[in-house]
């Protein structure tokens, strides 16, 4: 007698590993023999699909080599024309040993920044990711966290975070280890002990002492009144990443001595400076306060650059500020004799306005720094080639005088007139060519420290001195 199909063994959930075989069985009783079809996620599996084998009149479906994309709901449907079609469904869960798809890589990072070591994994069940530092499991804390993705994030990287790391991906089917990678922590040059100022009698011996640290260990250079030290003896020692430098001097004149510690991070350098003044007692003169005072510029070198009767800031960290600052400019200008005619006037304006800064008079004199935009204009437009050469020579130790380290401002550390047009001074004597400026990118509000804006027309960039806050 005709009999409607009945599925005697309903489909069950099948667990299978990647690249292994998985079989679903759909045993059917009926008369006449039914037609059996199979679907995956409601899409018909074609009989000629070579990834599958369908046997026993359609009652056995075999996936010949399971892939992770094969997971889903598989259904068999039996129909013989007697009664209705019957269906049974079961799930295929693709199991997979852990696999590290994006392993960590070696990282060099500067202290205080954020480091992320990637470790992206695959697997089913989803692997748990842990990290090993050296030979021990890494403990998470307020700075160190394993992210949902498996990556290791270290906030505010410290020196002690340096070392060898590997990630471990684990599930019920196995464990995978990444290769060992190295986290190197670099530290900006920092002066631990600054040289002390001395007020001495003529002909005295003085030893200036400067200690610095950093990773890599910095080098120390001494500058005397803006030039590489020409006299005196230097003794250096290095111990436990600390460099100690002693400069012994025979004093016949006052001077400004600067200890400059420099180390390299990739292509970039970090620099720390500390200065001491050597004054000769008879030469000392009373100052209005210990930082500096305002006075009309009376020198010669910057006469053509500074506004007439401009009030400038004289820095009392020098024994004789007017003479010392004039000497700084004079020495720097001598270096400029070899630069191009396009660069020279711009560089002269920058140097004069940087060494003799605009000043607000009063109880507390406040020098006004040059606007970042003007500094960048000199650096990247007027003197781009010269600036690169200067930096290259500095890095290779070929620069005859290291004067520029004192006299050239670090543009990124200057205020931008984009954020506060009254926070900084323009360079009115930049007699720039409007044609040149056409290639000068305008500032984007999101990156004022990088992009150089079109400078204002010379009519709006007159030399300004801000008198505000000069009273207590």
């Amino acid at each position: 007698l005709p009999k409607a199909p009945v599925i005697t063994t309903p489909l069950e959930t099948v667990d299978a590993l990647v690249e292994e075989v998985a079989t679903f069985m759909c045993a059917v009783e009926s008369y006449p023999q039914p037609e059996i079809s199979w679907t995956r996620n409601k899409i018909l599996i074609k009989l000629f699909d070579t990834r599958y084998s369908i046997r026993e009149n359609g009652q056995l479906l075999t996936i010949l080599s399971v892939e992770d994309s094969d997971d889903g709901i598989y259904c068999c449907t039996a129909n013989n024309g007697v009664g209705g079609a019957v269906e049974s469904c079961g799930a295929l869960q693709v199991k997979m040993k852990p696999k590290i798809t994006r392993p960590p890589i070696n990282v060099k990072i500067i202290e205080g920044l954020k480091a992320v070591l990637p470790c992206t994994t695959m697997g089913n069940p989803k692997p748990s990711v842990s990290w090993i530092k050296g030979d021990s499991p890494l403990r998470e804390n307020s700075r160190i966290a394993v992210l949902e993705s498996g990556s290791l994030r270290i906030h505010n990287v410290q020196k002690e975070d340096a070392g060898q790391y590997r990630c471990v991906a684990k599930n019920s089917l196995g464990t995978a280890y990444s290769k060992v990678v190295k986290l190197e922590v670099e530290v900006f040059a920092r002066i631990l002990r600054a040289p002390e100022s001395h007020n001495v009698t003529f002909g005295s011996f003085v030893t200036l002492h400067c200690t610095a640290t950093g990773i890599p260990v910095p080098t120390i250079t001494w500058i005397e009144n803006g030039n590489a030290v020409s006299s005196g003896s230097i003794q250096e020692s290095v111990k436990d990443r600390v460099i100690d430098s002693r400069l012994q001097l025979f004093i016949t004149k006052p001077g400004l001595y600067t200890c400059i510690a420099t180390n390299k991070h990739g292509e970039k350098f970090s620099t720390a400076k500390a200065a001491a003044t050597i004054s000769i007692a008879e030469w000392s003169k009373p100052q209005k306060d210990n930082k500096g005072y305002c006075a009309q510029y009376r020198g010669e070198v910057c006469n053509a650059v500074l506004a007439k009767d401009a009030l400038v800031f004289l820095n009392t960290s020098y024994a004789d500020p007017e003479e010392a600052q004039e000497l700084l400019v004079h020495t720097a200008w001598n270096e400029l004799k070899v630069v191009s005619p396009v660069c020279r006037p711009a560089a002269e304006a920058l140097l004069c306005n940087h060494i003799f800064q605009e000043c607000s008079p009063g109880v507390v004199p406040t020098p006004i720094p040059i606007c970042r935009e003007y500094c960048l204009a000199v650096k990247e437009l007027f003197c781009a080639k010269e600036w690169l050469v200067m930096e290259e020579k500095t890095h290779r130790g070929l620069y005859r005088s290291e004067m520029h380290l004192l006299s050239v401002p670090e543009c990124s550390k200057l205020p931008s007139m984009h954020w506060d047009p009254t926070a900084c001074a323009r360079l009115p004597h930049l007699d720039y060519n409007k044609e040149n400026l056409k290639t000068f990118p305008p500032m984007t509000s999101s990156k004022p420290s990088v992009d150089i804006p079109n400078l204002p027309s010379s009519s709006s960039s007159s030399f300004s001195v801000s008198p505000t806050y000069s009273m207590t």
Partner: antibody, heavy 115, light 113 residues
Framework: EVQLVESGGGLVQPGGSLSLSCVAS????????MNWVRQAPGKGLEWLSV???????YYADSVKGRFTISRDNVKNTLYLQLNNLKPEDTALYYC?????????WGQGTQVTVSS | EIVLTQSPSSVTASIGEKVTINCESS??????????LNWYQQRPGQSPRLLIY?????QSGVPDRFSGSGSGSTTDFTLTISSFQPEDVAVYYC?????????FGPGTKVELK
């Protein structure tokens, strides 16, 4: 884009204290002078204090000795400590960026001094 | 301290009309060929906004219908709106930055006629 977000305002009794904060973003905070300016309800603007890039502070006579301005360049935050508050200190307190012009203003935080 | 006086205290204007606001300083605010006098706009319910600094330099983003005047050792300064627009309804303040304490004028309220 420059953002200045003040917080810390509230209701306080006469003689009480409050600490206002202003979190700055979108610019290199340490390079700029920062100010506090207030505005009493329905009144004009009154400058209170400025702090320069070396953390030297200046004050209006009306708040000298009672208010203290400070800054944390690492946290990009400006502070104003208000002590010995009086009813006439009730106002909206603005955090403002600027040296000789008050260029960028926050939205303000309300301080109410009342018993 | 420097006292700033503004006039008129309030003004009503039609769209397209020219509006002039005056600010008088109790002493010169001239220093190194610059007048340290600024102008601000405060729309209802909003924070003040810098319009003009150094008496006549327009802040970036400010429409060119706003202009400031006052030069040399003058103590009289003017803010002009050449063609008044509905969005110009606000209180306008002058402020000196010649010395501390910084001081503001009492404000001029500009309304739409």
């Amino acid at each position: 884009e420059v953002q200045l977000v003040e917080s810390g305002g509230g209701l306080v009794q006469p003689g009480g204290s409050l600490s206002l904060s202003c979190v700055a973003s979108g610019f290199t905070f340490s390079l700029y002078y920062m100010n506090w300016v207030r505005q009493a309800p329905g009144k004009g603007l009154e400058w209170l204090s400025v702090i320069d890039t070396h953390s030297i502070a200046y004050y209006a006579d009306s708040v000298k000795g009672r208010f203290t301005i400070s800054r944390d360049n690492v946290k990009n935050t400006l502070y104003l400590q208000l002590n010995n508050l009086k009813p006439e200190d009730t106002a909206l307190y603005y955090c403002v960026l600027g040296r000789t012009a008050l260029v960028r203003w926050g939205q303000g935080t309300q301080v109410t001094v009342s018993s | 301290e420097i006292v700033l006086t503004q006039s008129p205290s309030s003004v009503t204007a039609s769209i397209g009309e020219k509006v002039t606001i005056n600010c008088e300083s109790s002493q010169s605010v001239l220093y190194n060929q610059k007048n340290y006098l600024n102008w601000y706009q405060q729309r209802p319910g909003q924070s003040p906004r810098l319009l003009i600094y150094w008496a006549s330099t327009r802040q970036s983003g400010v429409p060119d219908r706003f202009s400031g005047s006052g030069s040399g050792s003058t103590t009289d300064f003017t803010l002009t709106i050449s063609s008044f627009q509905p969005e110009d309804v606000a209180v306008y303040y002058c402020q000196q930055a010649y010395n501390a304490p910084l001081t503001f004028g009492p404000g001029t309220k500009v309304e739409l006629k």
